[in-house]
């Protein structure tokens, strides 16, 4: 069937349109185009005779039309009047006619729109604003944009006049935005320039900063006022109702108690005509006195006395605070505060209670600290320590012993040998000692203030023969690749050489072995399982030598990666499966099995009688050593084939 297609259907003025003919019949004589929906000689645009290829203009021809041999019609430089229907009349060779009608519409190219407003400075919560999109254009659609977004849904926004007018009722400051309108028709779309709505608002209730309302005498008062307002507010300050100045900030240096009072900030907006005020009450405090601490016992005795520290002066309705060692008071049953916190009592003082102690008086502004007070706690003497630590001496050397005991005041010392008083000194010196100087050496420490005494006794052996040494260790069960072990050869003896043997051999050269403390200490760094050997120390001097009993190092290690045996992985159905797992570990590891991820038993051997292909799968042995905190595992795949179908092994 003969049809006409308009390309495009909507045409902009000044552009062109092609009326394209589809399904044109064969054997044509010619055809003719008419304006309108029917064949009307008065409205013929153009005729065309195929045989002569001759185009003949009709009464409606405008000089802008071109006819093509395929009957299509091109109309150029379109004008508004071209809108409408066009009819093609086809004359066939058999003089049977056919007709088809097509149409298109013509629209103007839209101009750039602009926005007009009925109120350039609306007042918040009072005015409405109507924006109108200009010019008014027929067959145009009007759209609106706020901050480049489509209009939000709001009961305060209303479109009217075919969407050409946008009304904002009861404007708010949040309506201050960029507004654009857009006109659209089928052939064009244009957006206006932005219009910024300038909403007058405020002033809101002003805020006064800082929020601080308490000041100390002698400080500067610097208050700032701010109120949200458009245009910006004008500010005025009033103190106790009396006008001070028209500034945003109020500054009063070196204030006194007399500056206490109500401070009012007034914000004024000349455009809205509104005023708002905020009042803050400022209190100026006089400088409080500096506190100090008194004590009921300036020299308390450790574990005997209590001490009461009192914060002076006594001021009514005051908060008292305490600090020990610059920290707030620790929670302790030995520390007690009085009801008003003014007195801190230390029950049964210790030497660690020396302080320093500080008290504080808190007012509304700050805390005033006292000077620190240190307690002179009388303590001790503790058990005295006699040095050096040697207990064996060779005849002919000098014996020089020193005694020390922690004590306050410092201890007075006395020396006794086998119970007989020798001298009242901290050091005891005996030259050129002999075997007769062997005995019990007692140091007595006395604290004259507390009246307490403590003694320590040391056995001194003067002998050419050395004693049998022994080995002490700082770690009886070191973990491999982690721990170090220090062996020490006891006792500590003067003018003595210390020697070491490992498994009956002298020490091997190794960066992991270190001798120190005059060869008396042997340190093994980063022990390994190979260090689990017999260690012997020896002492010798020019007269004698002696060796210790061996000490065997128990190194914790593993578990290493386990081994499952036998290594076979293929079995015949009906055989017995007997898997054994082994992992090097000290202590022996805990074993457990999983078959296809399912936990089984915690034994070293896994036994399954008369296996079938159902026993196919992964067999995992897990090993764990809680002493080293380490785990390990291995997985083995087992294949069971039906009897006679595989060259596999049987258990």
């Amino acid at each position: 069937k003969l049809t006409i297609e308009s390309t495009p259907f909507n045409v902009a003025e000044g552009k062109e349109v092609l009326l394209l003919v589809h399904n044109l019949p064969q054997h044509l004589f010619g055809y003719s185009w008419y304006k309108g929906e029917r064949v009307d000689g008065n409205r013929q645009i153009i005729g065309y005779v195929i045989g002569t290829q001759q185009a003949t203009p009709g009464p409606a021809y405008s000089g802008r039309e071109i006819i093509y041999p395929n009957a299509s019609l091109l109309i150029q430089n379109i004008i508004q009047n071209d809108t409408g229907f066009y009819t093609l009349h086809v004359i066939k060779s058999d003089l049977v006619n056919e007709e088809a009608t097509g149409q298109f519409r013509v629209y103007p190219e839209l101009p750039k729109p602009s926005i007009s407003s009925n109120n350039s400075k609306p007042v918040e919560d009072k005015d409405a604003v109507a924006f109108t999109c200009e010019p008014e254009t027929q067959d145009a659609t009007y759209l609106w944009w706020v901050n480049n977004q489509s209009l939000p849904v709001s009961p305060r926004l209303q479109l009217s006049n075919g969407n050409r007018t946008l009304t904002l009722f009861n404007v708010t400051r949040n309506d201050t935005a960029s507004y654009k309108c857009e006109t659209q028709n089928p052939v064009s779309a244009r957006r206006s320039d932005s219009v910024i709505l300038n909403v007058l608002y405020g002033p809101d209730a002003p805020t006064i900063s800082p929020l601080n309302t308490s000041y100390r005498s002698g400080e500067n008062l610097n208050l700032s006022c701010h109120a949200a307002s458009n245009p910006p507010a004008q500010y005025s300050w009033f103190v106790n109702g009396t006008f001070q100045q028209s500034t945003q900030e109020l500054f009063i240096p070196n204030i006194t108690v007399n500056n206490s009072g109500s401070y009012t900030c007034q914000a004024h907006n000349s455009d809205t005509g509104l005023n708002r005020t905020t009042v803050t009450t400022i209190t100026v405090y006089a400088e409080p006195p500096k506190p100090f601490i008194t004590s009921n016992n300036s020299n308390p005795v450790e574990d005997e006395d209590a001490v009461a520290l009192t914060c002076e002066p006594e001021i009514q309705n005051t908060t008292y605070l305490w600090w020990v060692n610059n920290q707030s008071l620790p929670v302790s049953p030995r520390l007690q505060l009085s009801n008003d916190n003014r007195t801190l009592t230390l029950l049964s003082v210790t030497r660690n209670d020396v302080g320093p102690y500080e008290c504080g008086i808190q007012n509304e502004l700050s805390v005033d600290h006292s000077d620190p007070v240190i307690l002179n706690v009388l303590y001790g003497p503790d058990d005295p320590t006699i040095s050096p630590s040697y207990t064996y001496y060779r005849p002919g050397v000098n014996l020089s012993l020193s005694c020390h005991a922690a004590s306050n005041p410092p201890a007075q010392y006395s020396w006794l040998i086998d119970g007989n008083i020798q001298q009242h000194t901290q050091e005891l010196f005996i030259s050129n000692i002999t075997e007769k100087n062997s005995g019990l050496y007692t140091c007595q420490a006395n604290n004259s203030a507390s009246g307490h005494s403590r003694t320590t006794v040391k056995t001194i052996t003067v002998s050419a023969e050395l004693p049998k040494p022994s080995i002490s260790s700082n770690n009886s069960k070191p973990v491999e690749d982690k721990d170090a072990v220090a062996f020490t050869c006891e006792p500590e003896a003067q003018n003595t050489t210390y020697l070491w043997w490992v498994n009956g051999q002298s020490l091997p050269v190794s960066p992991r072995l270190q001798l120190s403390n005059g060869n008396r200490t042997l340190t093994l760094f980063n022990v390994t399982r190979n260090d689990a050997r017999a260690y012997v120390c020896g002492i010798q001097n020019s007269v004698s030598a002696n060796r210790s009993d061996p000490v065997t190092l128990d190194v914790l290690y593993g578990p290493d990666t386990p081994i499952i045996s036998p290594p076979d992985s293929s079995y015949l159905s009906g055989a017995n499966l007997n898997l054994s797992c082994h992992s090097a570990s000290n202590p022996s590891p805990q074993y457990s099995w999983r078959i296809n991820g399912i936990p089984q038993q915690h034994t070293q051997v896994l036994f399954i009688a008369k296996i079938t292909p159902n026993n196919n799968g992964t067999y995992a042995c897990f090993v764990s050593n809680l002493a080293t905190g380490r785990n390990n595992s291995i997985v083995k795949s087992i294949t069971v084939s039906a009897s006679g179908t595989s060259p596999g092994l049987s258990a």
């Epitope: 202590p587 590891p589 805990q590 457990s592 915690h602 896994l606 809680l626």
Partner: antibody, heavy 120, light 107 residues
Framework: QVQLVQSGAEVKKPGASVKVSCKAS????????LHWVRQAPGQGLEWIGY????????NYSQKFQGRATMTADTSTSTAYMELSSLRSEDTAVYYC?????????????WGQGTLVTVSS | DIQMTQSPSSLSASVGDRVTITCRAS??????LAWYQQKPGKVPKLLIY???NLVEGVPSRFSGSGSGTDFTLTISSLQPEDVATYYC?????????FGQGTKVEIK
């Protein structure tokens, strides 16, 4: 299910010996080690030693070394504990108990106990 | 030998109470510690091994913690059926030794 069934109560004279049996069922006897623990009347638990039924290896508490003998018959899945030179302080309930696994595991299944009374 | 010391030797608590029993080893036993429950006239029953592993079938109100030398058995909400004597036992090499036991009763 795992079961350990012990022999019945025994009354013995001081200086005599007693042999307590423990028949295991419900598991592979040779795979788990068997321990012996005793409990004197109103007292706590005291470990005597263990046997590895697979190898026959035994390990005794120092206190029972030389007096206790542990054996195992794998053909009947039965363990035995013999205590010689009995004294009145050996009066106790004797338990056999299976170790939960091998090496450094606790005891998961216990026999019902055998009361041994030593009295003149 | 490693000595095991339990405390308290006995305790009395109400149904629903949280109960804690402690066990101390004379030397480091790492995590090799088990807890047993023995009801009057019954055989001991293993509750926990490796200090914190709950044995299958034991109610979750029982829990164990600790390592080194100090260990704890906790019953989060005591039930009437929990009346028993509880023993700790180290399983770090032989000889195995047990604590002296803690008797738990209902008030």
């Amino acid at each position: 299910q795992v079961q350990l069934v012990q022999s019945g109560a025994e009354v013995k004279k001081p200086g005599a010996s007693v042999k307590v049996s423990c028949k295991a069922s419900g598991y592979i006897f040779t795979s788990y080690w068997l321990h012996w623990v005793r409990q004197a009347p109103g007292q706590g638990l005291e470990w005597i030693g263990y046997i590895n039924p697979n190898t026959g290896y035994t390990n005794y508490s120092q206190k029972f070394q030389g007096r206790a003998t542990m054996t195992a018959d794998t053909s009947t899945s039965t363990a035995y504990m013999e205590l010689s030179s009995l004294r009145s302080e050996d009066t106790a309930v004797y338990y056999c108990a299976r170790e939960y696994g091998n090496y450094n595991y606790p005891l998961d299944y216990w026999g019902q106990g055998t009361l041994v009374t030593v009295s003149s | 030998d490693i000595q095991m010391t339990q405390s308290p030797s006995s305790l009395s608590a109400s149904v629903g109470d949280r109960v804690t029993i402690t066990c101390r080893a004379s030397e480091n036993i790492y995590g090799y510690l088990a807890w047993y429950q023995q009801k009057p006239g019954k055989v001991p029953k293993l509750l926990i091994y490796n200090a914190k592993n709950l044995v299958e079938g034991v109610p979750s109100r029982f829990s164990g913690s600790g390592s080194g030398t100090d260990f704890t058995l906790t019953i989060s909400s005591l039930q009437p059926e929990d009346v028993a004597t509880y023993y700790c036992q180290h399983h770090y090499g032989t000889p195995y030794t047990f604590g002296q036991g803690t008797k738990v009763e209902i008030k």
